[in-house]
C-alpha cells in the first residue's frame, strides 16, 4: 500500500491521543535503554510503511502483535485516514490474525514494540519538519 495520500495530521493526532498510550502500556516494566533502535524511516509514507510491517507482519519470534490493542487502533487509524488502505490491507492482516494461536509477550515482542515507538516518534518528527 502506498501511504502517500494519508491524512498525516489526523494520524498523528490519533497516535498522540491513544495509540502511544497503549504502546507504552505494553512496554511497561522495561526501560527505553533496554533495546537499540535498528529500524528507521526517512519520510512520513516510509514511516507508515515500516509501522504497518512491524505491527502486522508476524516474525518467527513475535507472532502475536496484531491482536494487541495498539495494533487494532493502528489499523482503525490507517483505515480512517488512508483512503484505499482497508481494501488492500485489512483482509491480509485478518488472515494473519486467524493463523495465530497463543499470546505471549516475549522479549522479542518487547523489542519489536520498542522499534515501533521509535518509528512513531520519527513519523512525528518528520511531520514537524514539514510544518
Amino acid at each position: 500500500y502506498d501511504f502517500t495520500n494519508c491524512d498525516f495530521q489526523k494520524i498523528e493526532a490519533d497516535y498522540l491521543r491513544t495509540i502511544s498510550k497503549d504502546l507504552i502500556t505494553y512496554m511497561s516494566g522495561t526501560k527505553s535503554t533496554d533495546f537499540n533502535n535498528t529500524v528507521s524511516c526517512s519520510n512520513r509514507p516510509h514511516c507508515l510503511t515500516e509501522i504497518q510491517s512491524l505491527t502486522f507482519n508476524p516474525t518467527p519470534r513475535c507472532a502475536s502483535l496484531a491482536k494487541e490493542m495498539f495494533a487494532r487502533k493502528t489499523k482503525a487509524t490507517l483505515a480512517l485516514w488512508c483512503p484505499g488502505y482497508s481494501e488492500t490491507q485489512i483482509n491480509a492482516t485478518q488472515a494473519m490474525k486467524k493463523a495465530r494461536k497463543s499470546k505471549v509477550t516475549t522479549n522479542k515482542c518487547l523489542e519489536q514494540v520498542s522499534q515501533l515507538l521509535g518509528l512513531w516518534r520519527r513519523f512525528i518528527r518528520t511531520l514537524l519538519k514539514k510544518q
Epitope: 487494532r72 482503525a76 487509524t77 480512517l80 483512503p83 482497508s86 485489512i90
Partner: antibody, heavy 120, light 111 residues
Framework: QVQLVQSGAEVKKPGSSVKVSCKAS????????INWVRQAPGQGLEWMGV????????IYAEKFQGRVTITADESTSTAYMELSSLRSEDTAVYYC?????????????WGQGTLVTVSS | QSALTQPPSASGSPGQSVTISCSGS?????????VSWYQQHPGKAPKLMIY???KRPSGVPDRFSGSKSGNTASLTVSGLQAEDEADYYC???????????FGGGTKLTVL
C-alpha cells in the same frame, strides 16, 4: 442478536437541545463506526457524522459542525447524538447506523429511528 | 441540495430491468470504489443493498447489481418484483474531511 436500539420520540422547543441514544448489542461495539443519519419528512437521507469508539475519532458533516456532538460509552455499548440550537427544520427521523469494522463508509445495520419534532 | 444526483423517480413492469443512476464528481464517486446503495420502504429504516460499488451483502437477491463508470454509479434491478417498490439512495465515501455523501433518492415504482 445483532441490533441497534434507539431511544424514543422527542418533542422539543426551538433553541433547545436533544440527545438521542443508540444501544448496540451482539457485536464488538468499539471497532465499528457508529454513524448518525437524519431524514426530514418526505426528504432524503442526510449524513450527520460518525464516531469510532476504538480510537475516539469523530467526524462531522460540515453542515452540522458546531451544533452536533457525537459521543460513545464503550462500557454500555451506547452511542449518543446531541443536536443543539434546534429549529423547525431539524424535525426529522434520526437514525444511527453501523459502519463496518475498518470499512466505515457503508452501513450494514440500522437502528429503528427516533422521531424528533421541533415545535413551539 | 444533494451532493450526489439521482433521478427523482424510475419505473418498470414486473419482470423488467430498471437502472438508477447516481452522479457525483472525482472527489467522491470517481475517486474511490466506495459506493453503496440503500433500499428504504415507507416508514422503515434503510437497508444496505450494495457496497463497494458492486458487492452484495448476504441475503440480498442477485437481481440487484451495482456498477460504476467515471463519476457515475448505477444500480440495476433485474426481474422487477412488487416488493422492489421503494426509495433507493446512493452513497459515496468522499475523502477524510467530507467522509460520506448521500444522493437525493429515487422512488422506484413497479407498474
Amino acid at each position: 442478536q445483532v441490533q441497534l436500539v434507539q431511544s424514543g420520540a422527542e418533542v422539543k422547543k426551538p433553541g433547545s437541545s436533544v440527545k438521542v441514544s443508540c444501544k448496540a448489542s451482539g457485536f464488538t461495539f468499539g471497532s465499528y463506526g457508529i454513524n448518525w443519519v437524519r431524514q426530514a419528512p418526505g426528504q432524503g437521507l442526510e449524513w450527520m457524522g460518525v464516531i469510532v469508539p476504538l480510537v475516539g475519532v469523530t467526524i462531522y458533516a460540515e453542515k452540522f459542525q458546531g451544533r452536533v456532538t457525537i459521543t460513545a460509552d464503550e462500557s454500555t455499548s451506547t452511542a449518543y447524538m446531541e443536536l443543539s440550537s434546534l429549529r423547525s427544520e431539524d424535525t426529522a427521523v434520526y437514525y444511527c447506523a453501523r459502519g463496518q469494522e475498518y470499512f466505515y463508509w457503508y452501513f450494514d445495520l440500522w437502528g429503528q429511528g427516533t422521531l424528533v419534532t421541533v415545535s413551539s | 441540495q444533494s451532493a450526489l444526483t439521482q433521478p427523482p423517480s424510475a419505473s418498470g413492469s414486473p419482470g423488467q430491468s430498471v437502472t438508477i443512476s447516481c452522479s457525483g464528481s472525482s472527489s467522491d464517486i470517481g475517486g474511490y470504489n466506495r459506493v453503496s446503495w440503500y433500499q428504504q420502504h415507507p416508514g422503515k429504516a434503510p437497508k444496505l443493498m450494495i457496497y463497494d460499488v458492486s458487492k452484495r451483502p448476504s441475503g440480498v437477491p442477485d437481481r440487484f447489481s451495482g456498477s460504476k463508470s467515471g463519476n457515475t454509479a448505477s444500480l440495476t434491478v433485474s426481474g422487477l418484483q412488487a416488493e422492489d417498490e421503494a426509495d433507493y439512495y446512493c452513497s459515496s465515501y468522499a475523502g477524510t474531511d467530507t467522509f460520506i455523501l448521500f444522493g437525493g433518492g429515487t422512488k422506484l415504482t413497479v407498474l
